[in-house]
């Protein structure tokens, strides 16, 4: 529907509260360095303007596009040039180029201070003093640090954040009530951000078709009883929603997501038997619940895939006349039968099937050429199965921390040019696959593990894209979205790497390490491990283990010492010397 005023349309659809929240998220995701107060001022100005348009859609400027209105507003920021440098040049462009320019300047790793959690009493006081500002600040801080966070989902997080404070600030033991809830929100938020970042990368780097293929596979696994036409409709709508959110069109995205949730709930009978509970919830909870809903049971009487996709005389004709529909049907039929496969594996199988048809259909005897196509799937299925089996065994043997360390060493040897903080962050997250997925039965391990690894490796890809240092990373990240994980798995030690010069400062530690949380202490040790491997890429597991054990003992000893700083200085020198000797540095 064409509306006289887009801004009035969205304001009316979303309501003032959601409108303001979404505009704040949009602005914070674009101008990540701007102070909170500046953003609030801009949001209030936009909201007041929207209200005038609701009152009279023919009022001046009300017919302008949201990109024009928001872009004009962002470009009024006085400090744009000194704060953002060349991003200010975006303001010289016209829409749609201006919005594209803003999108290109989104920073996945903004130079912002780490969010430090204040004392519980301080937070509760701030919450009670000004609840609205407190919650806006939450949206602002998350949005600017995660410029691709799925905006309607961030509203859901904010609702849970508010509920946590409302409940816990009245509790007898505020901290015991609140801190676990905040930890859970933080961890879920990071996971949600990373998952959405992969969706945006899929759309922006590999195009709409890549995203649609992913969505067909995932929704077919989730809704195996739904007809292909129904799944196709959901995929089209879901693609629109994510295209909008990834493109900064947050008001349209949130509005369309609500419409999609409404449609799904109105048509649950033809979609899935698992939606009933979700559909009884309020909007934000409903959308979240649908997005996370468990797979429905597979229909009992599904025929063999071979009939339609190998044995039929019309295979090649159907393929050539409508590849998107025919391959979409193949993916749908395969995925609904295989909830035990990862989405990326299903996409690899579909790609193999397509490649085989493209090769065979023009041949003299197409059927003879493609008759054994399903046999080609076997090694593709076995590769992730074997990898997951091996790594889960390793995880069970080592535990999470040591499993992360094994991955740190493995990945540092593969791509030693990558920055140490990125290697630590990515390897720690890769290592979490163990506790996240290895507990599952065989049938759930692969979709859990490989699709999670896709999300984590995308973090590596987006961080590396900002400052590219390794051709191998670039190659694995850009050649094929579905083969990223196999590409990284196949990388061997980089023999071209010239070891880093030894720098004693890198291995100098101070008493402040003793006051760190267990997690932060692990990160310090893992940072040292990466640096060790960069200095000595050919070091054996045994050598590295010996040095790391000595390091752990050194930290433990000095943290127990009366004069911690002296201990770290003196024992540290000895440790560095011993480590150099042990590694032959």
């Amino acid at each position: 529907d064409a509306h006289k005023s887009e801004v009035a349309h969205r304001f009316k659809d979303l309501g003032e509260e959601n409108f303001k929240a979404l505009v704040l998220i949009a602005f914070a995701q674009y101008l990540q360095q701007c102070p909170f107060e500046d953003h609030v001022k801009l949001v209030n100005e936009v909201t007041e303007f929207a209200k005038t348009c609701v009152a009279d859609e023919s009022a001046e400027n009300c017919d302008k596009s949201l990109h024009t209105l928001f872009g004009d507003k962002l470009c009024t920021v006085a400090t744009l040039r000194e704060t953002y440098g060349e991003m200010a040049d975006c303001c010289a462009k016209q829409e749609p180029e201006r919005n594209e320019c803003f999108l290109q300047h989104k920073d996945d790793n903004p130079n912002l201070p780490r969010l430090v959690r204040p004392e519980v009493d301080v937070m509760c006081t701030a919450f009670h003093d000004n609840e609205e500002t407190f919650l806006k600040k939450y949206l602002y801080e998350i949005a600017r640090r995660h410029p691709y966070f799925y905006a309607p989902e961030l509203l859901f997080f904010a609702k849970r954040y508010k509920a946590a404070f409302t409940e816990c600030c009245q509790a007898a033991d505020k901290a015991a009530c609140l801190l676990p809830k905040l930890d859970e929100l933080r961890d879920e938020g990071k996971a949600s951000s990373a998952k959405q970042r992969l969706k945006c990368a899929s759309l922006q780097k590999f195009g709409e078709r890549a995203f649609k293929a992913w969505a067909v596979a995932r929704l077919s696994q989730r809704f195996p009883k739904a007809e292909f036409a129904e799944v196709s409709k959901l995929v089209t709508d879901l693609t629109k929603v994510h295209t909008e959110c990834c493109h900064g069109d947050l008001l349209e995205c949130a509005d369309d997501r609500a419409d999609l949730a409404k449609y799904i709930c109105e048509n649950q009978d033809s979609i899935s038997s698992k939606l009933k509970e979700c559909c009884e919830k309020p909007l934000l909870e409903k959308s979240h619940c649908i997005a996370e809903v468990e797979n429905d049971e597979m229909p009992a009487d599904l025929p063999s895939l071979a009939a339609d996709f190998v044995e039929s005389k019309d295979v090649c004709k159907n393929y050539a006349e409508a590849k998107d529909v025919f391959l979409g049907m193949f993916l749908y039929e395969y995925a609904r039968r295989h909830p035990d496969y990862s989405v990326v594996l299903l996409l690899r199988l579909a790609k193999t099937y397509e490649t085989t048809l493209e090769k065979c259909c023009a041949a003299a005897d197409p059927h003879e050429c493609y008759a054994k196509v399903f046999d080609e799937f076997k090694p593709l299925v076995e590769e992730p199965q074997n990898l997951i089996k091996q790594n889960c065994e390793l995880f069970e043997q080592l535990g999470e921390y040591k499993f992360q360390n094994a991955l740190l060493v493995r990945y540092t040897k593969k791509v030693p040019q990558v920055s140490t903080p990125t290697l630590v962050e990515v390897s720690r997250n890769l290592g979490k696959v163990g506790s996240k997925c290895c507990k599952h039965p065989e049938a759930k391990r692969m979709p859990c593990a490989e699709d999670y690894l896709s999300v984590v490796l995308n973090q590596l890809c987006v961080l590396h894209e900002k400052t590219p240092v390794s051709d191998r990373v670039t190659k694995c990240c850009t050649e094929s979205l579905v083969n990223r994980r196999p590409c990284f798995s196949a990388l061997e030690v980089d023999e071209t790497y010239v070891p880093k010069e030894f720098n004693a400062e890198t291995f100098t530690f101070h008493a402040d390490i003793c006051t760190l949380s267990e997690k932060e202490r692990q990160i310090k040790k893992q940072t040292a491990l990466v640096e060790l491997v960069k200095h000595k890429p050919k070091a054996t597991k045994e050598q590295l283990k010996a040095v790391m054990d000595d390091f752990a003992a050194f930290v433990e000893k000095c943290c127990k010492a009366d004069d911690k700083e002296t201990c770290f200085a003196e024992e540290g020198k000895k440790l560095v010397a011993a480590s150099q000797a042990a590694l032959g540095l």
């Epitope: 195009g207 709409e208 078709r209 090649c316 004709k317 393929y319 050539a320 006349e321 409508a322 590849k323 998107d324 529909v325 048809l357 493209e358 090769k359 065979c360 259909c361 023009a362 041949a363 003299a364 005897d365 197409p366």
Partner: antibody
Framework: EVQLLESGGGLVQPGGSLRLSCAVS????????INWVRQAPGKGLEWIGI???????FYATWAKGRFTISRDNSKNTVYLQMNSLRAEDTAVYYC???????????????WGQGTLVTVSS | DIQMTQSPSSVSASVGDRVTITCQSS???????LSWYQQKPGKAPKLLIY???KLTSGVPSRFSGSGSGTDFTLTISSLQPEDFATYYC???????????FGGGTKVEIK
């Protein structure tokens, strides 16, 4: 040496029919897909259709109904039957082989020299 | 409707110049089903590039192709006398019946 050689072009009246031939030498035609492409004087290339090795045919939307592609593997020849010809069908008609290993991609590695068809009263 | 728009329609250049020809497709081509052809007057077209960036055997390395989705480019890094010709892009889509060529770009001597 592999060669594709078109023949059968010439002057034809509007509403008339014509059958073009594409004789292939140097390879066994039965293993390859052959396309017909045309080019009006001073204009660009226009894909007409394809016949796969198995004999399955596909046509550009505008060519469906008036144009028919067939093959005779024993003669190593592909044909283009054109009916209800119009002045705008005046062009050089080429036959071209699809690169082996592709079925639906626009990759044509071997071309004939072309035959001119003129539709005029 | 399928649209394959080539630009510029003609370009005047000198030997040694770098020449760039673009091809814009609507909708996007199927995967990277995009080819580039060279045609000289009175001759049949010659396949230069397939899958958007792969050089056909025997084609000089001064020719290169790039792009994906809807936007593609043919670059001649250093124009040689034998490169003066008309260049066409060809696109393959979800349906084979939509196979289309661009309008052509004539590379002329300045």
């Amino acid at each position: 040496e592999v060669q594709l050689l078109e023949s059968g072009g010439g002057l034809v009246q509007p509403g008339g029919s014509l059958r073009l031939s594409c004789a292939v030498s140097g390879i066994d035609l039965s293993n390859y897909a052959i396309n017909w492409v045309r080019q009006a004087p001073g204009k660009g290339l226009e894909w007409i259709g394809i016949i796969w090795a198995s004999g399955t045919t596909f046509y550009a939307t505008w060519a469906k109904g008036r144009f028919t592609i067939s093959r005779d593997n024993s003669k190593n020849t592909v044909y283009l039957q054109m009916n209800s010809l119009r002045a705008e069908d005046t062009a050089v008609y080429y036959c071209a082989r699809t690169v082996p290993g592709y079925s639906t991609a626009p990759y044509f590695d071997l071309w004939g020299q072309g035959t001119l068809v003129t539709v005029s009263s | 409707d399928i649209q394959m728009t080539q630009s510029p329609s003609s370009v005047s250049a000198s030997v040694g110049d770098r020449v760039t020809i673009t091809c814009q497709s609507s909708p996007s081509v199927w995967l990277n089903f995009l080819s580039w052809y060279q045609q000289k007057p009175g001759k049949a077209p010659k396949l230069l590039i397939y899958e958007a960036s792969k050089l056909t055997s025997g084609v000089p390395s001064r020719f290169s192709g790039s792009g994906s989705g809807t936007d593609f480019t043919l670059t001649i890094s250093s124009l040689q006398p034998e490169d003066f010709a008309t260049y066409y892009c060809g696109g393959g889509y979800s349906s084979i019946s939509d196979t289309t060529f661009g309008g052509g770009t004539k590379v002329e001597i300045k």
